[in-house]
């Protein structure tokens, strides 16, 4: 049968390349079963996730799934960094794996460069 | 059923290009990474890179890079090798693999297309 | 890159025996989770590989309990407690905390 646990479906080592100034979501898909967890995202600094108080953040709820939405309005080269989201379900902390934010700066870059020249080409990214 | 098929493989001369597929089915390929590894005659195994089918993000050994494209089509469970200038040294059995990107929960892989480089 | 190496690189063993393997990688195979991405694969002579043990230690689904995996930050082990006749093949540590992702040379466990 189907586990009732909170599960937060985010890849490991899973990444996402985009501009500065553009709007962006980033996106903890969580399957609950009866009642929905409280979620939070935080962003790393070193071995420490640091808790994003005070952000736009939105449910949205597809069929088997719903998505915990932080929202980035533009986004900031300053945004650059690992994320991760937390279920707070049963008093327990159910944590995902990070999921990295390559920002470039299109003021620095002549042309937009692809995803994977992003993620493969650290000196166009802010740390 | 759980079936990764590779296909496209056989004879082809150096410097020319080949696409080898990767048909899956029994799982949502979009939960998965597609990793591709290849195992020359006698030797180990080596992995050519991975592809995210969800959005398209690719990694790669770096000595494929450039030469070496990864893709997949998400809505038809399919993932694609492209290998271009090959050389005698890429001879191998070619597998392309899925592993569950969330908790790791199976590594399923293909059962290989041979490679031949030569004139 | 990091680089794993496998001992021994083949091994003569009986039916009944234990046997161990080891994989030592060059640095820590520890990702920012607390975990280590260490794989072990089989693979029997003309065939694919086949994902025995994932995570160091979980055994994959429908792999027999006689195998299990140890080990922590650079050093891992597979041990076979009682080998069966099945179990004669070229085995291979491989990690996916680090890219590229990087494989033992492999051993290959033969009949005595």
């Known amino acids: 049968k189907e586990s009732c646990d909170v599960q937060l479906y985010i890849k490991r080592q899973s990444y996402h390349s985009i501009f500065a100034g553009d709007p962006f979501k980033l996106e903890c898909p969580v399957k609950y079963c009866a009642h929905r967890p409280q979620v939070t995202w935080c962003k790393l600094n070193g071995t420490t996730c640091v808790k994003l108080e005070g952000r736009h953040t939105s449910w949205k709820q597809e069929k088997n799934l719903s998505f915990f939405i932080l929202h980035f309005e533009p986004v900031l080269p300053s945004d650059n960094g690992s994320y991760r989201c937390s279920a707070n379900f049963l008093s327990a902390i159910i944590e995902s794996h990070s999921t990295t934010l390559y920002v470039t700066d299109v003021k620095s870059a002549s042309e937009r460069p692809s995803k994977d020249e992003m993620a493969s080409r650290p000196w166009l990214l802010y740390s | 059923e759980v079936q990764l098929v590779e296909s496209g493989g056989g004879l082809v001369q150096p410097g020319r290009s080949l696409r080898l597929s990767c048909t899956t089915s029994g799982f949502n390929i979009k939960d998965t990474y597609i990793h591709w590894f290849r195992q020359a005659p006698g030797k180990g195994l080596e992995w050519v890179g991975r592809n995210d089918p969800a959005n398209g993000n690719t990694k790669y050994t770096a000595s494929f890079k450039g030469r070496a494209t990864i893709s997949a089509d998400g809505s038809k469970s399919i993932a694609y090798l492209q290998m271009n200038s090959l050389k005698t040294e890429d001879t191998a059995v070619y597998y392309c693999?899925?592993?569950?990107?969330?908790?790791?929960?199976?590594?399923?892989w293909g059962q290989g297309t041979l490679v031949t480089v030569s004139s | 890159d990091i680089q794993m190496t496998q001992s021994p690189s083949s091994l003569s063993a009986s039916v009944g025996d234990r046997v161990t393997i080891t994989c030592r990688s060059s640095q820590s195979l520890l990702d920012r989770d607390g975990k280590s991405y260490l794989n072990w694969l089989q693979q029997k002579p003309g065939k694919a590989p086949k994902r025995l043990i994932y995570?160091?230690?979980k055994l994959d689904s429908g792999v027999p309990s006689r195998f299990s995996g140890s080990g922590s930050g650079t050093d891992f082990t597979l041990t076979i407690s009682s080998l069966q006749p099945e179990d004669f093949a070229t085995y291979y540590c491989?990690?996916?905390?680090?890219?590229?992702?990087?494989f033992g040379q492999g051993t290959k466990l033969e009949i005595k």
């Open positions: 995570l160091v230690s």
């Open positions: 693999a899925s592993y569950e990107g969330y908790y790791e929960r199976f590594g399923y």
């Open positions: 491989w990690q996916d905390t680090h890219f590229p992702y990087t």
